[in-house]
């Protein structure tokens, strides 16, 4: 008996060939001997089966002795043994129809789980293997689960169902809803304007939801909400904003926030959350602000940074075009009795300057100038 695998919703063509290459009488029946279709001369006739409106044949092939049964919009319950009766002989074809669907929506939030469920006919014992867009293979039976979806899981999942040494392939497009970056860090000199950007890693026709930026300043004992906003069809409207600092927000995507000036009291970490309409859970992006200040008080030149710096970073004070006078893995360094000239305060990672602030030290009888 020939086995043919089909996909739910697809069209399948079951073949039936006569030895004579001409149009002769044929019938297709199901395992209950109920007639599905056949011919009367050059006319297609249909029986009382459930397939009535979905069954067809190719009249153009009859003259060549081919009498296919075409079943459109396949259903799992179409799985059956189909019998073609032609020239006093019977050809049996076993059709097995499978369906593969994602648990809920194919648009899932980062960190959520994806469950793929296989619909299969009774008595079948298929195995399933799925390959994610990043090349990860998962195997299973009736259900396959992937927990903690990541951004790289966005794209086409290719799943192969194996039964009786035959296989059928399903493709499912999954969109992982996330920000492009899980975390970002902004380095600024005191007084500079700060731009925070939160680009999304997906595009959808309509995007509606609400969001909030909570901020934990390094100097503060608790976090506070800096801004809340609504998103309607990709248009941003601010609901509430603190007075200090007074953030500004762009009206269009990507989400964009401006802090008028970087101050030590603002240095710290923020968490932007975005709740999307009809989705449980929220999108998150962490943002960090590091602020640098260089000051001269009497005979002490000081360089300080505030905010979430890595213990790997070096803080240095150097006179322009000279070797560093002081360079330490600290958040504050100083030089006593600095000589006159342009001093540079540098925050660096393995020689790469992340943040720089210059301060002019004048001869001892005058006051310092900050360029």
């Amino acid at each position: 008996k020939k086995v043919v695998l089909g996909k739910k919703g697809d069209t399948v063509e079951l073949t039936c060939t006569a030895s004579q290459k001409k149009s002769i009488q044929f019938h297709w029946k199901n395992s209950n001997q109920i007639k599905i279709l056949g011919n009367q001369g050059s006319f297609l006739t249909k029986g009382p089966s459930k397939l009535n409106d979905r069954a067809d044949s190719r009249r153009s092939l009859w003259d060549q002795g081919n009498f296919p049964l075409i079943i459109k919009n396949l259903k799992i319950e179409d799985s059956d043994t189909y019998i073609c009766e032609v020239e006093d002989q019977k050809e049996e074809v076993q059709l097995l129809v499978f369906g593969l669907t994602a648990n809920s929506d194919t648009h899932l939030l980062q960190g959520q789980s994806l469950t793929l469920t296989l619909e299969s006919p009774p008595g079948s014992s298929p195995s399933v293997q799925c390959r994610s867009p990043r090349g990860k293979n998962i195997q299973g039976g009736k259900t396959l689960s992937v927990s903690q979806l990541e951004l790289q899981d966005s794209g086409t999942w290719t799943c192969t169902v194996l039964q009786n040494q035959k296989k059928v392939e399903f493709k499912i497009d999954i969109v992982v809803l996330a920000f492009q970056k899980a975390s970002s860090i902004v380095y600024k000199k005191e007084g500079e304007q700060v731009e925070f950007s939160f680009p999304l890693a997906f595009t959808v026709e309509k995007l509606t939801g609400s969001g909030e930026l909570w901020w934990q300043a390094e100097r503060a004992s608790s976090s506070k909400s800096w801004i809340t906003f609504d998103l309607k069809n990709k248009e941003v409207s601010v609901k509430r904003v603190t007075q200090d600092p007074k953030l500004q927000m762009g009206k269009k995507l990507p989400l964009h926030l401006t802090l008028p000036q970087a101050l030590p009291q603002y240095a710290g970490s923020g968490n932007l959350t975005l709740a999307l309409e009809a989705k449980t859970g929220k999108l998150h992006q962490e943002v960090n602000l590091v602020v640098m200040r260089a000051t001269q008080l009497q005979k002490n030149l000081t360089c300080e940074v505030w905010g979430p710096t890595s213990p790997k970073l070096m803080l240095s004070l150097k006179l322009e075009n000279k070797e560093a006078k002081v360079s330490k893995r600290e958040k504050a360094v100083w030089v006593l009795n600095p000589e006159a000239g342009m001093w540079q305060c540098l925050l660096s990672d393995s020689g790469q300057v992340l943040l720089e602030s210059n301060i002019k030290v004048l001869p001892t009888w005058s006051t310092p100038v900050q360029p």
Epitope: K312, R329, E330, K331, A332, S350, G351, Q352, V353
Partner: antibody, heavy 116, light 113 residues
């Protein structure tokens, strides 16, 4: 597990230059600072400088400033150390070492002999 | 530059006995900002590159036997081998990575008595 493989031994004349390579495998090259450390025969360890392949900018010890150039090629996961104006006291084993809070991974060392 | 000074220069200890190496830095390598001591210890055997034993003054590197331990803070540090084994014969170096240039101690040679 990062593995560092260095180029072979070199014999150089005083006043010339030497370029030693250090190829990384088995890890993300750009995640690690690459340091260069030398050891003269029977002596201790001396740090020469470092580079972070992401940034490509190097930091050198004052003793070697102007004579040493450290570079990195992310496409081949290879770091290089070039020392110029060689003198006999530069005869040493030159090591590349990765990471920053202690050098967790070391190359096998390259012996550079400076002799007329 | 921060100068690292080790003592003693060499040390002979019986198998199974405790070996203690001291390291003193010319200035503190304790970062008040991060509350970490930027100090590492290495072991070097003849013809081999050094091997990291300890970082952050007291954290054992992966795969290092627990007979090796590091202690101390600020300017004074100690490497202890609780029960010396034959394979521990080597030169031991301390190193600071708090400030550039990174500097090493002159080394301590450990032998079996």
């Amino acid at each position: 597990q990062v593995q560092l493989v260095q180029s072979g031994a070199e014999v150089k004349k005083p006043g010339s230059s030497v370029k030693v390579s250090c190829k990384a495998s088995g890890g993300t090259f750009s995640n690690n600072d690459i340091n260069w450390v030398r050891q003269a025969p029977g002596q201790g360890l001396e740090w020469m400088g470092w580079i972070n392949p992401i940034y490509g900018s190097a930091n050198y010890a004052q003793n070697f400033q102007g004579r040493v150039t450290i570079t990195a090629d992310e496409s081949t996961s290879t770091a290089y150390m070039e020392l110029s104006s060689l003198r006999s006291e530069d005869t040493a084993v030159y090591y590349c070492a990765a990471d920053w809070r202690g050098f967790d991974y070391w190359g096998q060392g390259t012996l550079v002999t400076v002799s007329s | 530059d921060i100068v690292m000074t080790q003592s003693p220069d060499s040390l002979a200890v019986s198998l199974g006995e405790r070996a203690t190496i001291n390291c003193k830095s010319s200035q503190s390598v304790l970062s008040s900002s991060y509350n970490k001591n930027y100090l590492a210890w290495y072991q070097q055997k003849p013809g081999q590159p050094p091997k990291l034993l300890i970082y952050w003054a007291s954290t054992r590197a992966s795969g290092v036997p627990d007979r090796f331990s590091g202690s101390g803070s600020g300017t004074d540090f100690t490497l202890t081998i609780s029960s010396l084994q034959a394979e521990d014969v080597a030169v031991y170096y301390c190193q600071q990575y708090y400030d550039t240039p990174l500097t090493f101690g002159q080394g301590t040679k450990v032998e079996i008595k």
